[in-house]
């Protein structure tokens, strides 16, 4: 068990021309909270998935009033640390989701207002017990610098906080096999107390009170050899004559999902499908409220009216469900004309049309220049019964309508992925990198820079601690 | 340079345990985040995943076919084995082995393919 | 399981031109364990794109990869005739981890 802790240091207009306008006026005066959602592993950050690790929400920060005629400063930022308490171990790598979020403190009917400023979204790899991490991620024209860092709670320690440790017995040494507890030299690693009962040969615990069960045996407390119908033969399992084998228990064996989760097996873990009320890595978290930050995509958490409903999320355009967790398939009213493919980019719907047709539900049908407009300064040119666009710079697509992708250019180097934004593009980068480009790489403690990509990767592709 | 090589009995029997070997160079299952995976195609038809194989010895098997699976590997050799009892004629087919790298838990892949072999079941 | 479906299972099409594929899942991926791959008649299959969007090394430019949840896009911009092949989406997420049944692109 542990905290993660984040702390904001400052959240404000980024470098570069064009910069925002303050969220908050005399008129309307405002003031900033954070969210964070966190999920194990290197998952999607912007997945309909729960935040598996946890999620919290600030404090209120000032109340701020914008100078007229002034440029937006960096924003008055709320007091202390984000922490998101985790039960399980520290993954090691993770996902997160930091959003700003500005309550308007005017005259609105049915008391303040909330609107979602910015949001920034990355990968990391980090150690519990580590240093604070440095980050700067960029939304739009805001700048988000924060740092973070992952904690053990006592008893716990160790890189992912699964190592207990207890203090000394003796003063001069540990006991037989137990090494001391770094940095905490005066303390012992105590030995891993597996589930009462758990079979020593056949089970084994890397957590206290669990008991995982070596290839060949299951049952909660391993002691049940591993068999199916067609191995029993007078030779017993493994038979040569019946050429029956005898798989190892897989991890969703005695399904280590609780509270009627349902439980897949991944490349090399599993995953918990948890049921409306429940979530974490078993689904083992329950009681949600608004503090656990359970809507998803953008999605306003307020406090239910009645006991039996903690929570109502209010969906931005585009979502729906309890927990805004459904994207609405706007493509199923069939928009694109002429046999049209319906793209629904979230923000937006884009349809693909067929050659021949164009428009921005493929409504023009294209038989030459004659009639035919290129929009944003672009160019008509006749060839093969078709016409085509020869469009100005910054603009694409058939009619020349479309903004070109700012992502083209694939502008996240090191292996930053780049999603287009509706004010330009946001970078997500990878491990060992931060900045607006993710062009600085990051050495926490004075590290290295990150080791060579394992074969098969090429240089810029998302790169690995081996 | 990454290279595998599958081998196998080429034809066999109904009921008989089908034994193949993937042989491996370019990298090695004592490094963290490599592993190793088998792949089988029917002839002109889709692949279907078997079963995989990690460095640590983390395992994976289709439950389709998890009763009739075993996969183990020799490090020291750059070997994998797979092992399928029972087979029948349904089971003939090429079988790929492919390596498998978890780039971080960010993604996993089959990032590099042996050329197959093929294996008929025929009484 | 995830059952992917891709379409068309068959496609013509001119050189030049470009080309769009699908591949729909039952239930959910994470884009990140979402792969296409490439094989030709006779041999072995290769890693074409990975987590849906990142070209594999020596890839040319013009293939590229989108999409999330259950719809997936594979996108020649310009079809030239050594992209004739068979391409295969694959799901590295949940087990059993499963194939398409391929989308067979031919030169008209």
């Known amino acids: 068990a542990g905290v993660f802790e984040l702390q904001i240091h400052s959240f404000g207009p980024g470098p570069g021309p064009g910069a925002p306008r303050s969220p908050c006026s005399a008129r309307l005066p405002c003031r900033l909270f954070f969210r964070v959602c966190l999920k194990p592993g290197l998952s999607e950050e912007a997945a309909e998935s729960p935040c598996a690790l946890g999620a919290a929400l600030s404090a209120r920060g000032p109340v701020y009033t914008e100078q007229p005629g002034a440029p937006a400063p960096d924003l008055p930022l709320p007091d202390g640390l984000l922490q998101v308490p985790f039960r399980d171990a520290w993954p090691g790598t993770f996902s997160f989701i930091i959003e700003t979020w500005r309550e308007e403190l005017g005259d609105q009917i049915g008391g303040p207002a909330w609107s979602l400023l910015a949001r920034v979204a990355g990968r990391r790899r980090l150690a519990a017990g580590g240093p604070w991490a440095r980050d700067i991620q960029r939304a739009g024209a805001w700048e988000l610098r924060f740092s973070y860092r992952a904690r053990c709670e006592p008893p716990a320690v160790g890189t992912a906080c699964t190592r207990l440790c207890r203090p000394r017995s003796a003063p001069s040494r540990c006991g037989p096999g137990l090494r001391p507890c770094a940095p905490l030299e005066d303390e012992c690693e105590a030995p891993l107390v597996c589930r009462a009962g758990c079979s020593p040969e056949h089970g084994f615990c890397e957590q206290p009170g669990e008991c995982r069960c070596l290839e060949g045996w299951t049952g909660p407390l391993c002691t049940v050899p591993v068999s199916t119908s067609s191995c029993l033969s007078p030779r017993g399992p493994s038979s040569a004559t019946t050429g029956c084998l005898v798989p190892g228990p897989g991890p969703c064996d005695g399904n280590p999902c609780a509270n009627g989760g349902s439980c897949s097996e991944t490349p090399r873990s599993f995953e918990c499908t948890c049921p409306r009320g429940f979530y974490g890595l078993r689904c083992e978290v329950s009681g949600v409220t608004c503090a656990d930050g359970p809507c998803f995509n953008g999605g306003l958490c307020v406090g239910g009216a009645d006991p039996d409903s903690a929570y109502i999320c209010h969906c931005p355009p585009g979502f729906q469900g309890s927990n805004c967790e459904k994207r609405v398939d706007r493509c199923s009213l069939q928009p694109c004309r002429n046999g049209g493919l319906c793209l629904d980019l979230g923000h937006a719907l884009r349809c693909r049309c067929r050659a021949g047709f164009a428009g921005p539900r493929c409504e023009h049908d294209l038989d030459d220049c004659a009639g035919r407009a290129c929009a944003n300064g672009g160019t008509c040119v006749e060839g093969g019964g078709a016409h085509r666009c020869s469009c100005a710079l910054g603009f694409g697509g058939r009619d020349c309508r479309e903004r070109a992708d700012p992502c083209a250019a694939r502008p996240c180097a090191h292996g930053g992925r780049c999603y287009a934004h509706f004010s330009g593009l946001v970078c997500a980068c990878a491990p060992g990198y931060m900045g607006a480009r993710c062009e600085f790489p990051v050495h926490p403690d004075g590290a290295s820079a990150l080791p060579a990509a394992p074969p098969g990767l090429r240089p810029g592709d998302p790169q690995r601690y081996l | 340079q990454v290279t595998l090589k599958e081998s196998g009995p080429g034809i066999l029997q109904p009921s008989q345990t089908l034994s193949l070997t993937c042989s491996f160079s370019?990298?090695?299952?004592?490094?963290?985040?490599?592993?190793v995976g088998w792949i089988r195609q029917p002839s002109g038809k889709g692949l279907e995943w078997l079963a995989h194989?990690?460095?640590?010895?983390?395992?994976r098997y289709n439950p389709a076919l998890k009763s009739r699976l075993t996969i183990s590997k020799d490090t020291s050799s750059s070997q994998v084995f797979l092992k399928i009892a029972s087979v029948d004629t349904a089971d003939t087919a090429t079988y790929y082995c492919?390596?498998?790298?978890?780039?971080?838990?960010?993604?996993?892949?089959?990032?590099?393919w042996g050329q197959g072999t093929s294996v008929t079941v025929s009484s | 399981q995830i059952v992917l479906t891709q379409s068309p299972a068959i496609m013509s099409v001119s050189l030049g031109e470009r080309v769009t594929m699908t591949c729909t899942a039952s239930?959910?991926?994470?884009?990140?364990?979402l792969h296409w791959y490439q094989q030709k008649p006779g041999s072995s299959p290769k890693l074409w794109i990975y987590?849906?969007?990142n070209l594999a090394s020596g890839v040319p430019a013009r293939f590229s990869g989108s999409g999330s949840g259950t719809s997936y896009f594979f996108t020649i911009s310009s079809m030239e005739a050594e992209d004739a092949a068979t391409y295969y989406c694959?799901?590295?997420?949940?087990?059993?981890?499963?194939f398409g049944a391929g989308t067979k692109l031919k030169i008209r």
């Open positions: 492919a390596r498998i790298a978890d780039y971080g838990g960010d993604y996993y892949a089959m990032d590099y």
């Open positions: 370019g990298f090695s299952l004592s490094t963290s985040g490599m592993g």
């Open positions: 194989i990690w460095w640590d010895d983390v395992k």
């Open positions: 239930s959910s991926v994470s884009s990140s364990y």
């Open positions: 987590s849906t969007s």
């Open positions: 694959h799901q590295y997420h949940r087990s059993p981890f499963t």
